[in-house]
């Protein structure tokens, strides 16, 4: 296994609809044709997997049907979007990239993006 640098933004604020997007960029040492991207959430020293996708270069990034993540790839960049976030989902979201093919296998782990999620205040009843 060889180490690889992965860059991602330090902080992202989710929209009022609970959607957060960020770019995960990896420094590929060669021309990878099969890449696996995983988003991990770290909170209270616990690490959980949010979503993952394996894709072939030039093809769409496909997450499972029930995944809260969507994404697109362009070169060595992956544009990730996480949906359905609530205030309780605030935490550090880490991008992990694995170059599966061709050999050698590379693993890169970003420093994480702190995603802040603020639940919208319910609209007060208005009299007309």
């Amino acid at each position: 296994c060889k180490a690889m640098h992965v860059a991602q933004p330090a902080v992202v604020l989710a929209s009022s609809r609970g959607i957060a997007s960020f770019v995960c960029e990896y420094a590929s040492p060669g021309k990878a044709t099969e890449v696996r991207v995983t988003v991990l959430r770290q909170a209270d020293s616990q690490v959980t997997e949010v979503c993952a996708a394996t894709y072939m270069m030039g093809n769409e990034l496909t997450f499972l049907d029930d995944s809260i993540c969507t994404g697109t790839s362009s070169g060595n960049q992956v544009n990730l979007t996480i949906q359905g976030l609530r205030a309780m989902d605030t935490g550090l979201y880490i991008c992990k990239v694995e170059l599966m093919y061709p050999p050698p296998y590379y693993l890169g782990i970003g420093n994480g993006t702190q995603i802040y999620v603020i639940d919208p205040e319910p609209c007060p009843d208005s009299d007309f």
Epitope: C1, T33, E34, K96, E98, M100
Partner: nanobody, 119 residues
């Protein structure tokens, strides 16, 4: 924790065929590179073949055209079909899995199965 169990080794004559199988326990089979290494007595361990989750394969030059690796996601198994076997293919063949578990890189190994090519 993933466990790998190999089967299918044995004694075969030169020019013969053998099929090795590796069964993986655990639910991380689909995200790991799976493959085979071999080690002959007094020699260094060498990669034979491996296969990615996407089905891309990689072979040692010495086995290209003779060996075929495959994976069955439904059964969590990796197979190695070995044809036109030669005496120099005699070795202990070990299944391996390489990938990552959360923030850690992992490599798992099977216990190995003996393949002997002799007349």
């Amino acid at each position: 924790e993933m466990q790998l169990v190999e089967s299918g080794g044995g004694l075969v004559q030169p020019g013969g065929s053998l099929r090795l199988s590796c069964a993986a326990s655990g639910n991380i089979f689909s995200r790991y590179i799976m493959g085979w290494y071999r080690q002959a007595p007094g020699k260094q361990r060498e990669l034979v073949a491996d296969i990615t989750p996407g089905g891309n394969t990689n072979y040692a030059d010495s086995v290209k055209g003779r060996f075929t690796i495959s994976r069955d996601g439904a059964k969590n198994t990796v197979g190695l079909q070995m044809n036109s076997l030669r005496p120099e293919d005699t070795a202990v063949y070990s299944c391996y899995a390489r990938g990552s578990d959360k923030l850690l890189m992992r490599t798992y190994w099977g216990q190995g199965t003996q393949v002997t090519v002799s007349s």
